[in-house]
Interface confidence: low
């Protein structure tokens, strides 16, 4: 309605004598700003005067002056929006209706607010959920329709008069919609809280009691049970009787059914609060409890462990592990059902009692072959001794023992022989199934554990065999000790270190790489002629005539081996020089004459020089000196000189005679 002023505030506010009231309020005037505000207590409209009568609690005028007695009541609003009020302290006679008389330039309005002030602080109100179940978290709410900035309060929770240790969350509201103080407590009630009193206590800022509200908790829970047994320790012997009684200590709502369980399984036809077990057997040993149900669900008692004692039953032996490997550890376990547990054990190996073995377990840290056999045991407790069971078999497995490689051949073995070896062993479990040989070769194994080496090599030094079952055991290697003729025979020059010159001292060595047997003889030969029988061949002063092809031989009792032919080369200066003439030493003028410088040299002559009868060198440097046409003046004695890398040599004089031709004689 556009002709109305619009207000928002709580409809009724609650307080008590001496407290205060805070009235949240907003408004919207029809036109313009607020010019006048009067707060009436229980205002009544006077038709005669066309004004409101009543107690004026607060009055503001255009000049803004407020009488001093009005300080108890405060207008906290403004001229266009806020109309919030505070009364502090508030008194019992403030109860009733508050009238807010608002005037703008052209419009007027009276807004009414109810105020309820009690003589004493009024109690808060506890709100509970419709149903509370044990162990399910619930929220308890305590609500008080009061809040004021000038009067702080607190709400505290008590259980059976004792402050609750759970943390409560307190919230306040001072809005135009609502004014309240609320405390919320999250709480997981147990069955033992059923019927207990919960209090929400209103206190002032100093903790002084103002008022409270109380409720009684109705906690729904499954039946709570106690079980009693005779005898109290629940330990009996076969044939004894046992009585168990189930007592309900609490149930909400009332219980409806009762049953008994053994090891979690329901016992048939047992629906009373007493369970009688007559002449019990060992099979009745176990965990017993009673179960009682109501609408919430089933409740169970604690378990009673009924132990029916009996003498040990026939025992069995468990072996960890069989078959066992020699050297490994083995554990034997004697298994016998008995109550109480056996206190003593007797162990047997192949029917013979094992001394000093009285424990449930027998541990052998290092198994040996003789440990194999049948193991059995007897268990004993306070009620008697059990029977010996069938026992268990221990199989001890081990690698082949004392493996040896045996040479079957007569000794010594020679290179090229056929050698037979066998692989022998002392014992084995499991049986030997194969053999291995080292080193590997293209050899025959004509039968299991036998090796045949055809055409044995000189370098076949050692052979080892292994006998194998699940493992292989290697024998120590045996030496074949193959005998052979000397190998890799060669001639080696010891001195001189450089090339051999005529006149040098020369030593040749006859080398070989190996020989078995080691005792050897040496032979040197040149062109099929025996030169010596030592490992070295020596020349004090070598001559060109010593050059040639040399071989050495080395022999032992198996055979002899020759080196490759080795060429001995002697270097020497040109020697035995002479000048030969062609066609002869007498030549007719006009013909041709060729002089040749012949020599013996190593390396060959590299340079020739020619000389005449005056020892005058001629401008010719080849081996042949050609005169064409020859003249009478060429007659005379000639000689030559040859040079190589070693040195020089010269020839004796050779005379050439050139005679006149018939024509020349005829002209004279």
């Amino acid at each position: 309605d556009s002709s109305k002023w619009v207000f928002e505030h709580p409809e009724t506010l609650y307080a008590w004598e001496g407290a205060c009231v805070w009235i949240p309020c907003t408004y919207r005037a029809l036109d313009g700003d607020l010019e006048s505000f009067i707060l009436f207590h229980n205002p009544e409209y006077n038709k005669n005067t066309s004004k409101f009568d009543g107690t004026r609690l607060y009055e503001s005028t255009k000049d803004g002056k407020v009488p001093s007695e009005q300080k108890r009541v405060q207008f906290l609003g403004d001229k266009n929006k806020n109309c919030t009020l505070s009364i502090h302290p508030v008194h019992l006679n403030d109860s009733g209706q508050l009238g807010l008389r608002m005037e703008s330039k052209t419009e007027k309005w009276m807004e009414r607010i109810h105020l309820n002030v009690s003589e004493r602080p009024f109690p808060p109100h506890i709100q509970l959920p419709p149903e509370i179940q044990e162990s399910q978290e619930v929220t308890l709410t305590c609500l008080l329709n009061f809040s004021c900035y000038g009067y702080p309060i607190q709400l505290q929770w008590l259980l059976e008069g004792v402050p609750m240790r759970q943390a409560a969350v307190t919230s306040t509201s001072l809005t135009i919609k609502s004014v309240f103080t609320r405390s919320e407590l999250k709480f997981s009630p147990q069955w033992s809280h059923h019927g207990k009193i919960v209090t929400c206590q209103l206190q002032d800022a100093d903790g002084k009691f103002l008022s409270n509200d109380t409720v009684q908790l109705n906690v729904k829970h499954t039946p709570k049970l106690e079980i009693k047994v005779t005898p109290s320790d629940a330990i009996v012997r076969e044939g004894d009787s046992v009585t168990m009684t189930c007592e309900v200590s609490s149930s909400n709502p009332e219980y409806t059914t009762v049953s008994w369980l053994k090891d979690g399984t329901s016992l048939k036809k047992q629906n009373t609060f007493t369970l009688n077990l007559r002449e019990v057997t060992k099979d009745q040993s176990g965990k017993y409890c009673c179960q009682v149900s109501n609408d919430v669900g089933p409740g169970r008692s604690e378990e009673v462990f009924l132990q029916v004692q009996y003498a040990p039953e026939p025992s069995t032996v468990q072996i960890l592990h069989s078959p066992a490997v020699e050297g490994s550890q083995v554990e034997f376990l004697c298994m016998s059902l008995a109550n109480p547990l056996p206190t003593n054990y007797t162990w047997y190996h192949n029917g013979k009692e094992m001394q000093g073995r009285t424990e449930e377990k027998v541990h052998i840290p290092k198994i040996l072959p003789w440990h194999a056999g049948t193991y059995s045991c007897v268990a004993e407790n306070i009620l008697g001794t059990g029977q010996r069971g069938p026992g268990a078999e221990l199989d001890v497995q081990y690698p082949p023992k004392k493996v040896t490689t045996v040479i079957q051949n007569p000794m010594p073995i020679r290179e090229g022989d056929t050698v037979t070896l066998s692989c022998n062993y002392n014992s084995s479990n499991p049986s030997v199934t194969r053999y291995e040989w080292k080193p590997h070769g293209a050899w025959e194994e004509p039968s299991l554990g036998v090796l045949k080496i055809q055409n044995v090599g000189w370098d076949n030094t050692t052979i080892a065999c292994a006998a194998c079952n699940s493992w292989c055991s290697w024998a120590s290697p045996v030496a074949l000790n193959v005998q052979y003729a000397p190998r890799d025979v060669r001639v080696r020059k010891i001195k001189p270190l450089s090339e051999i010159h005529s006149g040098n001292s020369v030593s040749l060595q006859c080398d070989f790489s190996s020989s078995h047997p080691k005792e050897v003889q040496f032979f040197w030969e040149k062109n099929g002629r025996l030169l010596g029988k030592e490992s070295q061949l020596n020349f004090d002063s070598i001559s060109p005539e010593d050059a040639g092809s040399y071989s050495c031989w080395v022999n032992n009792s198996i055979g002899q081996t020759a080196s490759k032919a080795w060429t001995l080369e002697v270097l020497y200066a040109p020697r035995r020089l002479r000048v030969s003439m062609s066609p002869g030493d007498q030549v007719m003028e006009g013909k041709s004459a060729t002089l040749t410088c012949e020599s013996d040299a190593n390396p060959p002559v590299s340079h020739y020089t020619w000389f005449d009868w005056n020892n005058q060198s001629l401008p010719y440097h080849s081996q042949k000196l050609r005169l064409e046409p020859v003249k009478v003046q060429h007659s005379g004695a000639y000689w030559c000189q040859g040079t190589n890398s070693v040195g020089k040599g010269r020839s004796p004089l050779s005379t050439l005679t050139v005679y006149y031709s018939p024509e020349t004689i005829g002209r004279r």
Epitope: V325, E326, G327, L368, W471, C472, S473
Partner: nanobody, 127 residues
Framework: AVQLVESGGGLVQPGGSLRLSCAAS????????IGWFRQAPGKEREGVSC????????NYADSVKGRFTISRDNAKNTVYLQMNSLKPEDTAVYYC????????????????????WGKGTLVTVSS
Amino acid sequence: AVQLVESGGGLVQPGGSLRLSCAASGFTLDHYHIGWFRQAPGKEREGVSCISNSGGSTNYADSVKGRFTISRDNAKNTVYLQMNSLKPEDTAVYYCAAGRWYYDGSRYCPPGAMDYWGKGTLVTVSS
């Protein structure tokens, strides 16, 4: 003289590492499978790890799997045990041993098949 000599033991904090060496003299190690064993005070000797003569097959006790590594250097005639993430329960005297038998990697070295044993080296794991 034929002998095996262990070295590399000592005091180490939990979580630490050690490298044990087993050096052979007087014989060629590459003909032999090598096992590491240990014996704690008052306890039985137990197999720790095993390596074949070629180094191609290895085996470890469950208690050391993923922490210990066995290796060998045949050229140096030496076998090693690298021990990481050590625990107080690894405290023991560690022995190496050499033996010759068919080894397929699926078992521990059987102590009964060992031809040569070392004198041991003490490993103490303590904070």
